[in-house]
């Protein structure tokens, strides 16, 4: 069965950090473009950023709210996406989901809670 | 999985004859919702790749000559050559792409008489 | 010009894996779905599946499950067929075609000129 | 960034009747005679999931209900009939250009 786990998710105090897991199986995870899409609670979805296939060179690219904080990774290896997430804000709590693709979602994880609270 | 069956195997026809060809699905290929049938006729000659010929069962495909016609509907169909000519000696396969799995027919071996 | 460019004819031991590339030149790569499809030697035509090159989701056919993968190198506009633990029934000219990605499957429009595998101790 | 307007942001339609929704761009996510646009359906407490790609291309395993079309910078999704279990909210999704981005969401409710 094609699945993807995040896990890493919890409460953080503002500007402190997390590292989440995204857990790849049933795929073939070295040719897909893995990304990150969060959800704050009540509202829309948004994209994070995207980590591409090593073949087309690993590059990384991240939506403005989170570039220079965040940094996606990943470990073929071990059929593993990460997700490191610095100096964290208020505005960052939300649900992470990791979707796996080319260009559109068609694996998503089932999320894991961040909450970023003083 | 749908089933395609060609028959002849194979025939020989004369130059200038007609040579037909026919093709029954075991079940339809007809699609409702655009009232289309999924349903294409490949020729392969030796040592060469299939050429598409018709698609959607009568449609040619472009730089196809006019002698060759598909016809049909659900599930039989039929490739007409209407005036053969030396060079459409060949092997021909129907194809549904209705469902997967897409599956082709046995073929049918057309030679010179 | 439309056109879809093979590998070359391999000659391989059982046991041993084969990759098969399929370049597409001429049309948009991520708007086709990019069909494999096998023929035996004196054989008729058998579909072995196809890989979704928007997506990159593949789908085999039930004879063609486990052995073999289908992959893609978008950047570079081309299909990957491989088969893994050769056997002497693999022995076969592999075909790429192009198709299409929708709730049907469309025809197969366009052709590669075959890569023969032969498998032989 | 290019911006993706979703309207209406919530509709009810009756089952068996059709839904519409639309999907505006602020500038053309068509590239290369494709255009790159997905649809999603997100059930409460569920990630969303694929319903069509390339703006037209349904999804393995989607119902045939679901449809979408347009091109350049307006895109729609169609659902008909509206069955009960399509009460969700759908979500439009360019991956055109960086950064790639989601409509705001509409939600369909069953009347």
């Known amino acids: 069965e094609v699945q993807l786990v995040e896990s890493g998710g919890g409460l953080v105090k503002p500007g402190g950090s997390l590292r989440l897991s995204c857990a790849a199986s049933g795929l073939t995870f070295e040719r897909a473009w893995m990304n990150w899409v969060r959800q704050a609670p009540g509202k829309g979805l948004e994209w994070v950023g995207r980590i591409k296939r090593k073949t087309d060179g690993e590059t990384t690219d991240y939506a403005a709210p989170v570039k220079g904080r965040f940094s996606i990774s990943r470990d073929d290896s071990k059929n593993t996406l990460y997700l490191q997430m610095n100096s964290l804000k208020t505005e960052d709590t939300a649900v992470y989901y990791c979707a796996g693709s080319n260009r559109a979602f068609d694996i998503w994880g089932q999320g894991t809670m961040v909450t970023v609270s003083s | 999985d749908i089933v395609m069956t060609q028959s002849p195997d194979s025939l020989a026809v004369s130059l200038g004859e007609r040579a037909t060809i026919n093709c029954k699905s075991s079940q339809s290929v007809l699609y409702a919702g655009n009232n289309r049938n999924y349903l294409a006729w490949y020729q392969q000659k030796p040592g060469q790749p299939p050429k598409l010929l018709i698609n959607q069962a009568s449609t040619r495909a472009s730089g196809v000559p006019d002698r060759f016609s598909g016809s049909g509907s659900g599930t039989e169909f039929t490739l007409i050559i209407s005036s053969l000519q030396a060079e459409d000696v060949a092997i021909y396969y129907c194809q549904q792409y209705y469902t997967p799995p897409l599956a082709f027919g046995g073929g049918t071996k057309l030679e010179i008489k | 010009q439309i056109q879809l460019v093979q590998s070359g004819p391999e000659l391989k031991k059982p046991g041993e894996t084969v990759k098969i590339s399929c370049k597409a030149s001429?049309?948009?790569?991520?708007?086709?779905?990019m069909n494999w499809v096998r023929q035996a030697p004196g054989k008729g035509l058998k579909w072995m599946g196809w890989?979704?090159?928007?997506?990159?989701?593949?789908t085999h056919a039930d004879d063609f499950k486990g052995r073999f993968a289908f992959s893609l190198e978008t950047s570079a506009r081309t299909a990957f067929l491989e088969i893994n633990s050769l056997q002497n029934e693999d022995t076969a000219t592999y075909f790429c075609?192009?198709?299409?990605?929708?709730?049907?499957?469309?025809?197969?429009?366009?052709w590669g000129a075959g890569t023969t595998v032969t498998v032989s101790s | 960034d290019i911006v993706l307007t979703q309207s209406p942001a919530s509709l009810a339609v009756s089952l068996g009747q059709r839904a519409t929704i639309s999907c505006k761009a602020s500038?053309?996510?068509?590239?290369?005679?494709?255009?790159?646009m997905d649809w999603y359906q997100q059930k409460p407490g569920q990630p969303p999931k694929l319903l069509i790609y390339?703006?037209?291309n349904l999804e393995s395993g989607i119902p045939a209900r679901f449809s979408g079309s347009g091109s350049g910078t307006d895109f729609t999704l169609n659902i008909h009939p509206v069955e009960e279990e399509d009460a969700a909210t759908y979500y439009c999704?360019?991956?055109?250009?960086?950064?790639?981005?989601f409509g705001g969401g509409t939600k369909l409710e069953i009347k």
């Open positions: 075609a192009r198709g299409g990605m929708g709730v049907r499957l469309r025809y197969f429009d366009v």
């Open positions: 001429g049309f948009t790569f991520t708007n086709y779905g």
């Open positions: 890989i979704n090159t928007y997506t990159g989701q593949p």
């Open positions: 500038q053309s996510v068509d590239y290369d005679g494709d255009s790159y």
């Open positions: 390339a703006a037209s």
């Open positions: 999704h360019q991956t055109n250009e960086d950064p790639w981005t």
